[in-house]
Interface confidence: low
């Protein structure tokens, strides 16, 4: 049979993108649940995912409400059946997390290349301007909106019968780039800010090349 | 009682992703488990892919991690693995299973109580 | 990753006798996430004993598990005919979780 002994939680990890925001951590409970807490290096703890046999919570709710704020969580365990009972110290065992700053931190989710349009040697390429869920009266801000011009994306672009590869940049969701008439020409984006000293960059978009159905063409 | 039942196409060509779903009858998926896949190759022991739980939580086995994606869709009672770059190694049976914690004199337990039948997935060209 | 060593691989009795399989970890496991498993050919594991020792719903009491840290057994006493099959031990604490390589149990 069980034992009340409690372990506390370890490996607290945030995992964090477009401001999706959880905290992780081990081990899977055998003696115990857990409860987090929360908080802004200044506030009150505010308590979230009460008592559960999982091992991660959703903290989202909590960090959008102001994402350059530095959160600090920490996991509770409590001997399974018996919540009100506390350890030898009088409280029951918890781990920090490290801080967590989501504006410098989460990271850039893989960018969509939206659509793309040719008119004669130029090709306009729209990366989609992805819904965030930071809140601001009642409506979710698009990455854009919450980083504003620290986001740039990166084309990277190639003819499809070569591998040598350009790159253009913008401060906005749409690239302008030449390209050779009559020549299909394949590409891909990544999110990147600069400023940042980790986490820089998304993940790349998946690959779109000309002649497929998202492009237009116009002579 | 709570059944599992894996589906999924039999047949899938190298480089391609294997696409697997696992309805749950006779019980929630909400109701506190995890959901594991669980693979074995032909003539040989058996393989944890990964589990989740049905807030979305998800551990995998390292040696698959890169490869691997499961979700669960608490709507349709169904938890999915998506398996991406296949090659022939990827051939076996797949199986579905509840990863029950269960909570007895002050602890918790888990074991795999529910199994699906097992779907054969053969990757070739 | 904690590797589940099992042994025998095959093991050739009669019915009536008694079957002591073992399984072996690499590392210390908690009894909590230590189960046995029993795989007939065409058909999925069946749960037979979770907790090391605690017999799962619906399984006779010939069947009994034992062992705790790193050494566990499963036991079944007196061998029926439908008994004879693979059997898998399985840990669900540790990342990656594991099963042993399996012991065969086959009519002598």
């Known amino acids: 049979s069980g034992t009340t002994n409690t372990v506390a939680a370890y490996n607290l990890t945030w995992k964090s993108t477009n401001f999706k925001t959880i905290l992780e951590w081990e081990p899977k409970p055998v003696n115990q649940v857990y409860t987090v807490q929360i908080s802004t290096k200044s506030g009150d703890w505010k308590s979230k995912c009460f008592y559960t046999t999982d091992t991660e919570c959703d903290l989202t709710d909590e960090i959008v409400k102001d994402v350059k704020q530095t959160y600090l969580a920490r996991v509770f365990s409590y001997p399974a059946g018996n919540v009100e009972s506390t350890g030898s110290a009088g409280e029951p065992l918890y781990e920090n997390s490290p801080e967590f700053t989501p504006y410098l931190e989460t990271n850039l989710g893989q960018p969509t290349i939206q659509s793309f349009e040719q008119v004669g040697t130029k090709v306009n390429v729209t990366v989609e301007d992805e819904r965030t869920l930071v809140r601001r009266n009642n409506t979710f801000l698009s990455l854009r909106d919450v980083f504003g011009k620290d986001l740039i994306y990166t084309l990277y672009y190639w003819k499809s019968s070569s591998s040598g590869k350009k790159t253009a940049k913008t401060n906005t969701n749409e690239f302008l780039i030449d390209v050779e008439k009559g020549v299909s020409y394949c590409f891909f984006a990544q999110a990147v800010i600069p400023s940042r000293t980790v986490n820089r960059k998304s993940t790349d978009s998946p690959v779109e090349c000309m002649g497929q159905e998202k492009g237009e063409f116009r002579e | 009682q709570v059944q599992l039942q894996e589906s999924g196409p039999g047949l899938v060509k190298p480089s391609q992703t294997l696409s697997l779903t696992c309805t749950v009858s006779?019980?929630?998926?909400?109701?506190?488990?995890?959901w594991s896949w669980i693979r074995q190759h032909p003539g040989k022991g058996l393989e944890w892919i990964g589990e989740i739980y049905y807030s979305g939580s998800t551990r995998y086995n390292p040696s698959l991690k890169s490869r691997v994606t499961i979700s669960v869709d608490t709507s349709k009672n169904q938890f999915s693995l998506k398996l991406s770059s296949v090659t022939a190694a990827d051939t076996a049976v797949y199986y579905c299973?509840?990863?029950?914690?269960?909570?007895?004199?002050?602890?918790?337990?888990?074991?795999?109580?529910?199994w699906g039948k097992g779907t054969t997935v053969t990757v070739s060209s | 990753e904690i590797v589940l060593t099992q042994s025998p691989g095959t093991l050739s009795l009669s019915p009536g006798e008694r079957a002591t399989l073992s399984c072996r970890a690499s590392?210390?496991?908690?009894?909590?996430?230590l189960a046995w498993y029993q795989q007939k050919p065409g058909q999925a594991p069946r749960l037979l004993i979770y907790?090391?020792?605690s017999r799962a719903t619906g399984i006779p009491d010939r069947f009994s598990g034992s062992g705790s840290g790193t050494d566990f057994t499963l036991t079944i006493s007196r061998l029926e005919p439908e008994d004879f099959a693979v059997y898998y031990c399985q840990q669900v604490g540790v990342v990656p979780y594991t099963f042993g390589g399996g012991t065969k149990v086959e009519i002598k």
């Open positions: 590392q210390s496991v908690s009894s909590s996430y």
């Open positions: 299973a509840r990863d029950t914690p269960y909570y007895y004199d002050g602890g918790y337990y888990y074991y795999m109580d529910v």
């Open positions: 907790g090391a020792s």
């Open positions: 006779g019980g929630s998926i909400s109701s506190g488990q995890y």
